[in-house]
Structures are given as C-alpha cells and as structure tokens.
Interface confidence: medium
C-alpha cells in the first residue's frame, strides 16, 4: 500500500523499531531475550521475559513458581498466568479457615444446620454456612426435612465445621461421599473467567512454546520463556509447577506457560493432607459413617455436606444412582473404591468432626 510508505519510513533507520505489515504500523523492537506482550509493542514496558511452564513473571521480573492446588481439598480458582500465580480455593463443600498467599492453608467442611435451623446463607469457598432459626410452618428455604423441624431449645446458629487435618496430624477427616472428582470437575468449569490474566491481550500461542528465534522481526509471538514444568509468574519469573509423579496422584490440569499443573488424588482416594495445587497425603476413600447420609450438590461452591438422615430412614452410603441421592451423572468410573475397614463403623453424632485413624477406622476428632 503506497499510503503506508510514510509510516514505514518512520521506522527506517531506527534500530529500536520495525514495521509490522500485518498491523501496518511501527512497532518497538523488544531487546534480545525479551518478548512482546502484544502484537505490536509500542514501548519497553510492552516487553517481558519468558519463564518455564508453571512459573510466572513476578513484579521483580523473576520467574516464580505458581502455587499448586494439588491438595485434594483445593481447586484451581484462576490459572497460572504469565504474570500471576495460580489461585486456589477450598473445594466445593468446604470453606477456608486459614488463608495463605493465593491459596488456603486449612479448609473445613461446611456446617450442616442442626435441627430447628435452616440455611440463611449457603457456605462458599471463603465462608461457612450461616444458619438461622426456622420460622413456624414450612419455609421455602427448607432444603431437607431436618431443616424444617420445629426449633428445639438450645439450637446453635452454626454447627461445628469438620476440619481437614493439617499436615502435622496423622488422622484424616472423614470425607464426604459424592466424589471429589465430581466436585472438582464442576468447579473446574468455573475456573477461568473471560477476563482472567491469561486470556486478555496475550499472544494465543501454545503454552510453554516460544518462537523459533528469540524474537522474529514483526512477530507478536514473543515472550519470556520458562523451562517445561515452570510457568511465568506476574513478575516475570519462572515458577515451578507442582508434580503429580506420586503413584497416588493424577494430573487434574496440565502445567501451562502461565499456570501451574494441578494434581488430585487418584480415583478411589481422597486427600487427607492438602498441599498447594496438590495433595500431600491421599487415603482410600471411605464410605459414610453409620447414621450419616450425604446430600450431593453439583455447584462449585456447594458440595456434599454431612447431614443426619430423616427419621425412619436407613442410611445408604453406596454411591449408586438407585440410592436416589447421587447425581444422575454419576458413572461407574466415579464410584470410588472403599477400604473394607472403613465400613465397620459405629454411629457418630453428625455434629462431631469425624476422622480416620491409620487403620482406616473412623475416630472422633476432638477438634
């Protein structure tokens, strides 16, 4: 185009710029080793380093390991991006009691409203369930027969949440039936928002890949690279993705150029001790304790919660569709294997935290 000649001429003889025919404008030439954050950089701030996959470029221009959501009680909220760490939150059905940078150090199961109470605010990844006294008569907020009983004396606004044992504990929390994988799959559908850092104004090249040259002239596909298994953090540092190499872990989400890998316990197991983006200790998935049934929910922020069975009913903890409790989408592959010892249980009050001993038998957790 002849009309482009004046624009092209403005780049000529200026070693710090080049003319990009695709966008028909003069672009800033990123120095060797730096890569543009957009197709036609205009200034030095439009250039950055590259990191290995699972590392992100931090504020100090260093490649930093994205946190890992590999603990079984965590799910990825936002992915590891070139300029920001992955963010983890408690998995559906749990809330964070002890926060950590870009993650949660300790998750608890949402409380179940005791008899005579109904849910005022459902639990989220950040907050526990809030209960309120049931009004006389049937309330539309009643989620189950228990919640619609007449208020009894001495009811509390919130049942004691069930903790996931910290790394220092040898006991693991009795997990909720319904399948962590199902919950995580539901949650993963909500992880990346359209405006997440990794999807806005970034080159859409394959994660972790880079141009065949440090920065081909006129190319927009230039950014700081990280070694595989590292991702580019917000400050431009390569940050380590977690590894799912242990036999009891499987990869949930891959390590990307701008986000960490996430691991979860393999089918048939549940996480007893969480770790960022992974699980430090997986245990066989137990079945429900006697006198306990579960209420599966399929929303990311509302997972299965322990609940006393309605009067006159028998607990059925078999994760099968004919139960009437399990979601219709439950498939055989999502029916989790159970250690036979876990079924030899005694009745346990639902308000008490339940944990597994090293033998797989439930024990009461003193708190």
């Amino acid at each position: 185009f002849p009309q482009d000649r004046p624009f092209e001429d403005t780049c000529h003889g200026n070693p710090s710029h080049y003319y990009d025919k695709a966008v028909r404008r003069c672009c800033y030439r990123c120095p060797m080793g730096l890569f543009p954050t957009q197709q036609c950089p205009q200034r030095p701030t439009d250039c950055r380093k590259q990191c290995e996959p699972d590392y992100y470029l931090d504020e100090a221009d260093r490649c930093t390991a994205c946190v890992t959501c590999s603990r079984d009680d965590l799910v990825e909220k936002t992915p590891c991006a070139w300029n920001s760490s992955r963010v983890c939150e408690c998995r559906p059905g749990m809330f964070c009691s002890t926060s950590a940078v870009n993650s949660c150090a300790r998750c608890f199961f949402h409380s179940v409203c005791p008899a005579g109470m109904i849910v005022k605010f459902p639990g989220t990844a950040q907050k526990n369930t809030v209960c309120e006294p049931a009004s006389p008569g049937v309330s539309p907020a009643c989620a189950s027969p228990e919640n619609c009983k007449e208020p009894s004396s001495g009811t509390i606004p919130q049942a004691k949440p069930t903790p996931v044992s910290p790394a220092t504990s040898s006991a693991s929390t009795m997990p909720v039936r319904g399948g962590t994988r199902l919950a995580q799959e539901a949650a993963s559908k909500l992880t990346r928002a359209p405006d997440s850092p990794s999807s806005v104004g970034r080159p859409s090249s394959d994660p972790g890949l880079s141009p065949t040259q440090p920065c081909p002239e006129g190319s927009g596909d230039c950014r700081k690279q990280c070694e595989p298994d590292y991702y580019l953090d917000e400050a431009g540092r390569c940050t380590a993705c977690v590894s799912c190499s242990r036999d009891d872990l499987v990869e949930k989400t891959p390590c990307a150029w701008n986000s960490s890998r996430t691991c979860e316990c393999r089918p048939g197991m549940i996480c007893a001790t969480s770790a960022t983006n992974s699980c430090a200790r997986c245990v066989p998935y137990p079945i429900c304790a006697a006198e306990t049934v579960t209420k599966p929910q399929d929303m990311a922020e509302k997972d299965t919660t322990f609940e006393a069975p309605p009067l006159g009913t028998q607990p059925d903890c078999n994760p099968t569709p004919e139960n009437g409790e399990a979601p219709a989408s439950t498939s055989p592959t999502q029916s989790l294997l159970v250690d036979s010892q876990a079924s030899k249980t005694l009745p346990i009050p639902t308000s008490a935290p339940v944990a597994l001993s090293s033998t797989g038998k439930p024990v009461l957790d003193a708190g």
Epitope: V67, P228, D229, S243, S245, A275
Partner: antibody
Framework: QVQLQQSGAELAKPGASVKMSCKAS????????MHWVKQRPGQDLEWIGY????????DYNQKFKDKATLTADKSSSTAYMQLSSLTSEDSAVYYC?????????????WGQGTLVTVSA | DIVMTQSHKFMSTSVGDRVSITCKAS??????VAWYQQKPGQSPKLLIY???TRHTGVPDRFTGSGSGTDYSLTISSVQAEDLAVYYC?????????FGSGTKLEIK
C-alpha cells in the same frame, strides 16, 4: 537413560575465553531445557542460567550475564557454555544439568562436570 | 535473590542414628525446595524436590519436610554410604539458589 557428557578440563590464562560442551543422549534434546551450574572448590553451587535448545532462548542469573554465553546445537544434541574475560574467580567445576519434566523439579540429571582452571 | 541458609557446615553422626539437616530461605518459597547429595569427586544427586517428594530410586530413609521458610532433610537411619555434603536448593524462583551445604560426617 538420560546422560550428559561434558568436555574435558580446561586450563586458561586470565582474560582468555573457554567454551565447554555438554552432549546429551537418552532423550530428545530439544525437549529439555539445559541448566548450567558453577561450583568453586570447597564452595556451594551457583545457578548460571538455562537455554531452551528448541528455540535458543536463554535466561541468565544476573551475576553471570556478562560472563557466560549459552548456546545449543540441535544437530549434535550438544549444549555449550562460553566463559569470557576469565579471572581466578572463574576457576571452578561447571556442570550442565536438566530436569525430568512432569516428575521432578530439581535437577535430576547432571553432567560429570568440567573443571576450568584460570592461571597465569 | 532468595538466599538459602544452611546453618550447620558440619554434622557428626553415627551409623544407625537419625539426623536432620536444616535449611532456611530468606523468604517464603512455597515448599519449592530440593535436596541434593554430593559425594567427593561426584556430581550432585537429586534426593528430594517440592520439599518432601522423593526422587526416583532414593531410599526411603531420606525424608524431606517443611513449609514457608524452614525446611529439613531427615535421614532416619544413617548408613556409611550417606557420608556426603547435602545441599538445599529453592526451585521456586529464578535465579535458582542453593544453600552452602552441610557435610555429614560419620563418627
């Protein structure tokens, strides 16, 4: 199995340059980034930088930016490190190392090291 | 840069003893810590990564632990062949940095 074979010892004069090699075998050379690590006698380890052999992308520890130059030759599956303007401080064993992606974050594979001695 | 400090240059132990080697990071490294064993005249050998994950083929007497800034490598029952220098390394952020090493001596 993964093997990293480094070139032999180098004796150099102050101000000179040396170029050492690290030949990779047992894996696809372009799939693994190559790291370089320095170890002075009786001292700790220092990360120099790394190169992505598939793209020749390099990133350096700021301390070694003007000292080391990393290159790679895909055809021979060999990574190189050149050290320039040598001083006695550069006398050390230099290792090439790589990771086992997806299963380890530390340096799982190391070359045997190249000893560089700078002496007048 | 992140500084990794190994406060003990030397540790003396006996065969069969349990020993813990410590490492402190100058800032939180989110468990992205590796441990290496280096015997005289040899290249370093990876033992542990992500603070507690044993590398392939590493005997289970080697255990890593820690979080935040404090990490340790424990040998549950020291063997004669464990005589070596042990280095911690943060693989959290570039530039990757190593501790100064702890030499394990057998009494």
């Amino acid at each position: 199995q993964v093997q990293l074979q480094q070139s032999g010892a180098e004796l150099a004069k102050p101000g000179a340059s040396v170029k050492m090699s690290c030949k990779a075998s047992g894996y696809t050379f372009t799939s693994y980034w190559m790291h370089w690590v320095k170890q002075r006698p009786g001292q700790d380890l220092e990360w120099i930088g790394y190169i992505n052999p598939s793209t020749d992308y390099t990133d350096y520890n700021q301390k070694f930016k003007d000292k080391a130059t990393l290159t790679a030759d895909k055809s021979s599956s060999t990574a190189y490190m050149q050290l320039s303007s040598l001083t006695s401080e550069d006398s050390a064993v230099y290792y090439c190392a790589t990771r086992h992606y997806g299963s380890s974050y530390g340096f799982a594979y190391w070359g045997q090291g190249t000893l560089v001695t700078v002496s007048a | 840069d992140i500084v990794m400090t190994q406060s003990h240059k030397f540790m003396s132990t006996s065969v069969g003893d349990r020993v813990s080697i410590t490492c402190k990071a100058s800032q939180d490294v989110s468990t992205a810590v590796a441990w290496y064993q280096q015997k005289p005249g040899q290249s370093p050998k990876l033992l542990i990564y992500w603070a507690s994950t044993r590398h392939t083929g590493v005997p289970d007497r080697f255990t890593g632990s820690g979080s935040g800034t404090d990490y340790s490598l424990t040998i549950s029952s020291v063997q004669a062949e464990d005589l070596a220098v042990y280095y911690c390394q943060q693989h959290y952020r570039t530039p990757f940095t190593f501790g100064s090493g702890t030499k394990l001596e057998i009494k």
